[in-house]
Interface confidence: low
C-alpha cells in the first residue's frame, strides 16, 4: 500500500455514506425546482386523468435518447444554460407544399422546409433559444456517404452549415444536425418558410454525386416522386428554450455574486 | 455561538492566503516534475552555453501560440494524458520533389507530401503519438473561402478529412487541422511519402471552384509554378507525443489504483 | 463566468480564480526550465456554500443554487473549470527538448 | 477513468462516483413528475489525498500525482467530470411540459 | 459607482422601535455581503452586524437581543431593526458593503454610506 | 470576546514626518486586520486589509506590518490630507469584528 509515516497530509475522513445521500438527495430537491424556477411543487389539481399523450412520450423519448452526430451536454456551461429548457418540436412541413415544387429533379439533394410561424410559437423570442436540432431518420445505407447540410438563402442561394461521413447500416438511425444559429436567425427574421438541403458531397473531379442515404419522409428515387410522410418520423427540429415566463429571472453572469 | 441559529450549514473557515499559495507551489512542484517522470530535476552539466537555438525557439513559440481552429486543451483528459507530451514538427517535403509533378496543374487544390522516415524518427510507435496537427500559414485573403482537406489514399484516390470557412483578412493566420489519426496510420503502414490536398469546397452545382487562399510555400498562381519555400514557414506536422522512454511506465487506468 | 477576467478585477469573496504566478528559479529554486521562466498557474479558492436543507426557506435558497451548488453536490467544491497548457523547454543532456505539459494554467473556477 | 463501470465494481475507498438512485415518489415525496419515475443521479466521494511536501519521498509520491491531485490543488477535492441532462414530463396546470435539465446525472469523478 | 444611503434616522423616544434602511445602488446588491456599524458621537466605530446574500446574518452580542438585520433584494435594501431603544444607542449609523477575498473577510468594509443620525431621547 | 488596544490615542506631527500607529489584539488574529482613516462629518475609509495589502487607489506612502497580536500602520511621510482619525480593525471571523478606539492624528 503506497501509505505511509509520511502520509501527513491525507484528507481521509470516516464518511457517513447515508448521511452523504440524505444530503444529496436534499440537494437534488432544490436543484430541479431551482432549475424550474419553481418556489414548491406544482399543483396537480387539474391533471387530466389517463397516460401521457402520445406526442408526449414521443418528445420525451426524443429527448432522453443520445443520437449520432450529437454530442453530450456541452461544457462549461454558461450561466444562463444552468436552468431547465423546455424541448418541443416542429415536423418539417409536408411534401405536398408548392414550395417543394421547383426543388424537385435533383438526384443529390433533398429538401426540408419549415413553417416559422410553428417556429415562434415554440419560441417567441430568438434570445430564449438555447439549442435547435435537425432530426433525420436514415434508413439503412447500403455503401458510406459524405453528405453536407446547407440552409436556404435569399433567391435559391444556398449557405453550408456542416457535413457528417455516414457509415453503412442495416438498421434505421437517427441524424441530429446543430442548427441553432440557423433557426435563431429564422426567429429574427419575417420570413414565413425556410429550409434546408442535404446533398451529397462533390468533390470537384468527382463524376457520381448521386445521394444514396434513404431519409425517412422520402422515397428512395427522390426523382419528382415524392412519398407520403411516415408518421411522426419525418424531418423535424427539435428546440430547447427557455420559458418566456421564466426569462426574465436571468441576469448576466458577470454581475451575478 | 456567534452565528445565528439558520446558519447551521455554512463551510465557513479560517484560510491562510500565504499557507495556500505555498501549498500550490509546493503541489506544482511535484506536479512538474511528476508530468515529465523525473524523480528530481535533470543535471545542468552538459548544457551548451549560449542562447537557445533558433529552431527549438521556432518550435516552442508554436507550441506556445493559439491558432486558428485549433480548440484549447481537450477534455476530460484519457489517464496517458496526463504526462508531457515532446512536442517535434515535421516540414512538408519541399515542392521540387519528384512527388509534386503529377498534382501540378489543378486550380482548385494545393498538395503537401511528407516523408514518413522523418515521422518515425519523431515517434518511433504510432501508440506514442498524442497530437497532430497539420498547420499551414494563410496569406491575404480577399474573400470568404470554403476549403476542404483530404488525406492521399491508395492509387492516388482523395479521402475527406474536414473542412474550413476562411474569412477574409488582411493579415496572415496560422490554420491547423487535427490529423492525428491520419498520422498514427501513417506511421503503421510502411509508405515512404504520404500526403494532403487542400482544396476548394465544391458543391454539385457551383461553376468556379478556383482556391482563392494562399498559403505560404506556394506561389499565387498554383498553375505548376511552385515557387521556393519561404524559411520555416512551409507547412509542417506539429507533433506531439509520448517520449519512448517514458511510455514504459503509462499503465491501463482501470488497475491503476 | 468564474474567470480571470472576473475574478482578478473583483473581491469576490465566494470561490473565484485566484491570481498566482510561479517563477520557476525564486519559487522553486529550479534553473533548468528554460523557457518560460515562469507562468500564471493561478488557483481556485473560496467557499462554495452549502445552501439546501429541509429547514431552509425555499426562496431564500432557490436563487443561489446556480451560483454555489449548480451540481447540487453534498458538499460543494471549488475547483477547476477551465484549464490551459503549458509548455516548456529543457535539456536532457545535451539535447533540448520541448514538452507540452497539460492542465497547468487555471482559467477559471466553478463550484462543483 | 473514476467513472461507473470502474466504480461500481470495485471497492475504491478514493475519490469514485457512487450509486445513487433517486425515486422521485419515495426519496423526494413528489407525485408531480410524470417521467421518469426516478434516475441514477450518484454523486462523487472519496478523499483525494494531499500528497506532496518537501520531505516526502519523491519516487513514493510522484505515480500518484496522476490519481490523487492531477491539477496540483493546494486542496484536491473529489468533485464530477462527466455530467449528463435529465429530460422530465410534467404538467403545468392542464399543459403536459417536456424540459431538460442539464448536468444532472453524474457518470465519473476526478480528483480537482 | 458604489452608492449607499441610509435613511430612517431621527430622534425617538427610549423604549421604541426605529426601522433604518440603506438604498444601494452602482453594483450588484444580491450578490454581496452588508454590514451596519454605528458611531456614538465624539466616540468609536461600533460593529453591529452582518448579512450575508442568502439572508444568513452575524451580530455582535450585545446586539443579539434588540437588533435585526434584514434585506430585501428585489429593492436593493438593507435594514437594521432597532427595539427597546436607550439612550446609549444615540449614534451616526453606517451601512458598508462587506468585502473579502475568502471567507473571513466577510468583515472588511470596502465601501460605505455617509450616515443617519438616530438621537434616543426623552 | 476578542479587545483591540490603539496607541496612542492621538498624536500631533508635521507634513513630512514618518508616523507609525500600533494596535494590538487581545488574543491572536493571523492577518485578519484592516485599517480605516476617517474625517470629520465623513465615513471612515478602508485603507489597508490582511494587515499589508493597500487598498486600491490608496497612496503608497501607507503600509501596514504585523501578524499574531502586534500591528503597526506607517505613513512614511505625512501630507495635509492625512490629518484624521486612524481605526484598527479585526476579523478573523463573526465574533471578533472589533475596532480599536481611534488614532487621532493632529497638526503639530
Known amino acids: 500500500d503506497y501509505k505511509d509515516d509520511d502520509d501527513k497530509l491525507s484528507t481521509s475522513k470516516t464518511i457517513d455514506m447515508e448521511l452523504v445521500k440524505r444530503k444529496r438527495i436534499e440537494a437534488i430537491r432544490g436543484q430541479i425546482l431551482s432549475k424550474l424556477r419553481l418556489a414548491s411543487p406544482p399543483s396537480q389539481g387539474e391533471v387530466p386523468p389517463g397516460p401521457l399523450p402520445e406526442a408526449v412520450l414521443a418528445l420525451y423519448n426524443s429527448t432522453r435518447d443520445r443520437v449520432a452526430g450529437e454530442s453530450a451536454e456541452p461544457e462549461p456551461e454558461p450561466e444562463a444554460d444552468y436552468y431547465a429548457k423546455e424541448v418541443t418540436r416542429v415536423l418539417m412541413v409536408e411534401t405536398h407544399n408548392e414550395i417543394y415544387d421547383k426543388f424537385k429533379q435533383s438526384t443529390h439533394s433533398i429538401y426540408m422546409f419549415f413553417n416559422t410561424s410553428e417556429l415562434r410559437e415554440a419560441v417567441p423570442e430568438p434570445v430564449l433559444l438555447s439549442r435547435a436540432e435537425l432530426r433525420l431518420l436514415r434508413l439503412k445505407l447500403k455503401v458510406e456517404q459524405h453528405v453536407e447540410l446547407y440552409q436556404k438563402y435569399s433567391n435559391n442561394s444556398w449557405r453550408y452549415l456542416s457535413n457528417r461521413l455516414l457509415a453503412p447500416s442495416d438498421s434505421p438511425e437517427w441524424l441530429s444536425f446543430d442548427v441553432t444559429g440557423v433557426v435563431r436567425q429564422w426567429l429574427s427574421r419575417g420570413g414565413e418558410i425556410e429550409g434546408f438541403r442535404l446533398s451529397a458531397h462533390c468533390s470537384c473531379d468527382s463524376k457520381d454525386n448521386t445521394l444514396q442515404v434513404d431519409i425517412n419522409g422520402f422515397t428512395t428515387g427522390r426523382r419528382g416522386d415524392l412519398a407520403t410522410i411516415h408518421g411522426m418520423n419525418r424531418p423535424f427540429l427539435l428546440l430547447m428554450a427557455t420559458p418566456l415566463e421564466r426569462a426574465q429571472h436571468l441576469q448576466s453572469s458577470r454581475h451575478r455574486r | 455561538d456567534y452565528k445565528d441559529d439558520d446558519d447551521k450549514l455554512s463551510t465557513s473557515k479560517t484560510i491562510d492566503m500565504e499557507l495556500v499559495k505555498r501549498k500550490r507551489i509546493e503541489a506544482i512542484r511535484g506536479q512538474i516534475l511528476s508530468k515529465l517522470r523525473l524523480a528530481s530535476p535533470p543535471s545542468q552539466g552538459e548544457v551548451p552555453p549560449g542562447p537557445l537555438p533558433e529552431a527549438v525557439l521556432a518550435l516552442y513559440n508554436s507550441t506556445r501560440d493559439r491558432v486558428a481552429g485549433e480548440s484549447a486543451e481537450p477534455e476530460p483528459e484519457p489517464e496517458a494524458d496526463y504526462y508531457a507530451k515532446e512536442v517535434t514538427r515535421v516540414l512538408m517535403v519541399e515542392t521540387h520533389n519528384e512527388i509534386y509533378d503529377k498534382f501540378k496543374q489543378s486550380t482548385h487544390s494545393i498538395y503537401m507530401f511528407f516523408n514518413t522516415s522523418e515521422l518515425r524518427e519523431a515517434v518511433p510507435e504510432p501508440v506514442l503519438l498524442s497530437r497532430a496537427e497539420l498547420r499551414l500559414l494563410r496569406l491575404k485573403l480577399k474573400v470568404e473561402q470554403h476549403v476542404e482537406l483530404y488525406q492521399k489514399y491508395s492509387n492516388n484516390s482523395w479521402r475527406y478529412l474536414s473542412n474550413r470557412l476562411l474569412a477574409p483578412s488582411d493579415s496572415p493566420e496560422w490554420l491547423s487541422f487535427d490529423v492525428t489519426g491520419v498520422v498514427r496510420q501513417w506511421l503503421s503502414r510502411g509508405g515512404e511519402i504520404e500526403g494532403f490536398r487542400l482544396s476548394a469546397h465544391c458543391s454539385c452545382d457551383s461553376k468556379d471552384n478556383t482556391l482563392q487562399v494562399d498559403i505560404n510555400g506556394f506561389t499565387t498562381g498554383r498553375r505548376g509554378d511552385l515557387a521556393t519555400i519561404h524559411g520555416m514557414n512551409r507547412p509542417f506536422l506539429l507533433l506531439m507525443a509520448t517520449p519512448l522512454e517514458r511510455a514504459q511506465h503509462l499503465q491501463s487506468s482501470r488497475h491503476r489504483r | 463566468a468564474l474567470d480571470t477576467n472576473y475574478c482578478f478585477s473583483s473581491t469576490e469573496k465566494n470561490c473565484c480564480v485566484r491570481q498566482l504566478y510561479i517563477d520557476f528559479r525564486k519559487d522553486l529554486g529550479w534553473k533548468w526550465i528554460h523557457e518560460p521562466k515562469g507562468y500564471h498557474a493561478n488557483f481556485c479558492l473560496g467557499p462554495c456554500p452549502y445552501i439546501w436543507s429541509l429547514d431552509t426557506q425555499y426562496s431564500k435558497v432557490l436563487a443561489l443554487y446556480n451560483q454555489h451548488n449548480p451540481g447540487a453536490s453534498a458538499a460543494p467544491c471549488c475547483v477547476p473549470q477551465a484549464l490551459e497548457p503549458l509548455p516548456i523547454v529543457y535539456y536532457v543532456g545535451r539535447k533540448p527538448k520541448v514538452e507540452q505539459l497539460s492542465n497547468m494554467i487555471v482559467r477559471s473556477c466553478k463550484c462543483s | 477513468a473514476l467513472d461507473t463501470n470502474y466504480c461500481f465494481s470495485s471497492t475504491e475507498k478514493n475519490c469514485c462516483v457512487r450509486q445513487l438512485y433517486i425515486d422521485f415518489r419515495k426519496d423526494l415525496g413528489w407525485k408531480w413528475i410524470h417521467e421518469p419515475k426516478g434516475y441514477h443521479a450518484n454523486f462523487c466521494l472519496g478523499p483525494c489525498p494531499y500528497i506532496w511536501s518537501l520531505d516526502t519521498q519523491y519516487s513514493k509520491v510522484l505515480a500518484l500525482y496522476n490519481q490523487h491531485n492531477p491539477g496540483a490543488s493546494a486542496a484536491p477535492c473529489c468533485v464530477p467530470q462527466a455530467l449528463e441532462p435529465l429530460p422530465i414530463v410534467y404538467y403545468v396546470g392542464r399543459k403536459p411540459k417536456v424540459e431538460q435539465l442539464s448536468n444532472m446525472i453524474v457518470r465519473s469523478c476526478k480528483c480537482s | 459607482q458604489v452608492q449607499l444611503v441610509e435613511s430612517g434616522g431621527g430622534v425617538v423616544q427610549p423604549g421604541r422601535s426605529l426601522r433604518l434602511s440603506c438604498a444601494a445602488s452602482?453594483?450588484?446588491?444580491?450578490?454581496?455581503?452588508m454590514n451596519w456599524i454605528r458611531q456614538p458621537p465624539g466616540k468609536g466605530l461600533e460593529w453591529i452586524g452582518y448579512i450575508y446574500t442568502s439572508g444568513t446574518t452575524y451580530r455582535a452580542n450585545w446586539a443579539r437581543g434588540r437588533f435585526t438585520i434584514s434585506r430585501d433584494n428585489s429593492k436593493n435594501t438593507l435594514y437594521l431593526q432597532m427595539n427597546s431603544l436607550r439612550a446609549e444607542d444615540t449614534a451616526v449609523y453606517y451601512c458598508a458593503r462587506g468585502w473579502h477575498i475568502f471567507d473571513h473577510h466577510y468583515w472588511v468594509m470596502h465601501a460605505w454610506g455617509q450616515g443617519t443620525l438616530v438621537t434616543v431621547s426623552s | 470576546d476578542i479587545q483591540m488596544t490603539q496607541s496612542p490615542s492621538s498624536l500631533s506631527a508635521s507634513v513630512g514626518d514618518r508616523v507609525t500607529i500600533t494596535c494590538q489584539a487581545s488574543?491572536?488574529?493571523?492577518?485578519?486586520l484592516a485599517w480605516y482613516q476617517q474625517k470629520p462629518g465623513q465615513p471612515p475609509k478602508l485603507l489597508i486589509y490582511?494587515?499589508?495589502t493597500l487598498e486600491y487607489g490608496v497612496p503608497s506612502r501607507f503600509s501596514g506590518s504585523g501578524s499574531g497580536t502586534d500591528f503597526t500602520l506607517t505613513i512614511s511621510s505625512l501630507q495635509p490630507e492625512d490629518f484624521a482619525t486612524y481605526y484598527c480593525q479585526s476579523y478573523s471571523d463573526g465574533d471578533s469584528v472589533i475596532f480599536g478606539q481611534g488614532t487621532k492624528v493632529e497638526i503639530k
Open positions: 490582511a494587515a499589508s
Open positions: 488574543q491572536s488574529i493571523s492577518t485578519y
Open positions: 452602482g453594483f450588484h446588491f444580491s450578490s454581496e455581503a
